[in-house]
Amino acid sequence: TPEVWVQVRMEATELSSFTIRCGFLGSGSISLVTVSWGGPNGAGGTTLAVLHPERGIRQWAPARQARWETQSSISLILEGSGASSPCANTTFCCKFASFPEGSWEACGSLPPSSDPGLSAPPTPAPILRAD
């Protein structure tokens, strides 16, 4: 069974800047990754970035830099200023569309006791939905 992991990290240098890393643990070919916050995409969540492995990357504020880290993982840096900036208990979700497994999504947030610059290891998060 495929799994999605989500890691949220607060940057030590900018306390309101976050890095979200997501990965897909499966054998299929990833066709699209959607990163959202405030809940799953399409269920009250707001899209921050969309990453296609060949067509490119689109992102919207407060997302600052979305990128592919490997063929099965991505990272997203969020700006920390302004009304739309994330807070410590913000939930971030990553949805991986893959062939032939379908869509798999998981969410994560900053660990409650995390010090700036530290985060929980990127273990698989609970799978919320498989379309």
Epitope: V50, P53, T70
Partner: antibody, heavy 114, light 113 residues
């Protein structure tokens, strides 16, 4: 079938504003961002910006900041672009195109003339 | 901004001939994480919107004839039409799909002798 239907040609005076539309059908409007592209007569293509219908978030080409404003109406699955303080340099065909540029509208011709 | 430079600006070939056109970017379009090039090619016929031919530098969009082939990596890319047909009369544009703003080349106009 994905379709992007753009509004008709506009003849406007210098200094005025114009707002054109791009009505999407055949897919879930909020699932895909919308791009806008300018093509002056006989010239190449210029990316103006894009809008995320999911939350109204926008990205602009710095060259078009202050010139173009992108909005959406989710209830009618329509994207809009307003151009302000028009000059002859703004005379062009303007296209909407769904994210990744696989689907394009037919274009709206804007002519700025006194 | 990434500058996209296309050459030649125009070319004239006979039906059945092979044609190649070049596109160079001022910065690399390679996504190092997944080793994909974010470059697209479009065909624009007179009075029509552009049509996506190739994305990811070499992947043909659905429905595009296999006589169209994209190749290249980093900053140097090529579009090849293996056997030109009369309906290929058009202007061909490359596009940086890597970084905003998503700039286009100035185009290569293909004429049929």
């Amino acid at each position: 079938e994905v379709q992007l239907q753009q509004s008709g040609p506009e003849l406007v005076k210098p200094g005025a504003s114009v707002k054109m539309s791009c009505k999407a059908s055949g897919y879930t409007f909020t699932d895909y961002s919308m791009n806008w592209v300018k093509q002056s007569h006989g010239k190449s293509l210029e990316w103006i910006g894009d809008i995320n219908p999911n939350n109204g978030g926008t990205n602009y080409n710095q060259k078009f900041k202050g010139k173009a404003t992108l909005t959406v109406d989710r209830s009618s699955s329509t994207a809009y672009m307003e151009l302000r303080s028009l000059t002859s340099e703004d005379s062009a065909v303007y296209y909407c195109a769904r994210v990744w540029f696989a689907y394009w509208g037919q274009g709206t011709l804007v002519t700025v003339s006194a | 901004d990434i500058v996209m430079t296309q050459s030649p600006s125009s070319l004239s070939v006979s039906e059945g001939e092979k044609v190649t056109m070049s596109c160079k970017s001022s910065q690399s379009l390679l996504s190092s994480g997944n080793q994909k090039n974010f470059l697209a090619w479009y065909q624009q016929k007179a009075g029509q919107p552009p049509k996506l031919l190739i994305y990811g530098a070499s992947t043909r969009e659905s429905g595009v004839p296999d006589r169209f082939t994209g190749s290249g990596s980093g900053t140097d890319f090529t579009l090849t039409i293996s056997s030109v047909q009369a309906e290929d009369l058009a202007v061909y544009y490359c596009q940086n799909a890597h970084s905003s703003p998503f700039t286009f080349g100035s185009g290569t106009k293909l004429e049929i002798k």
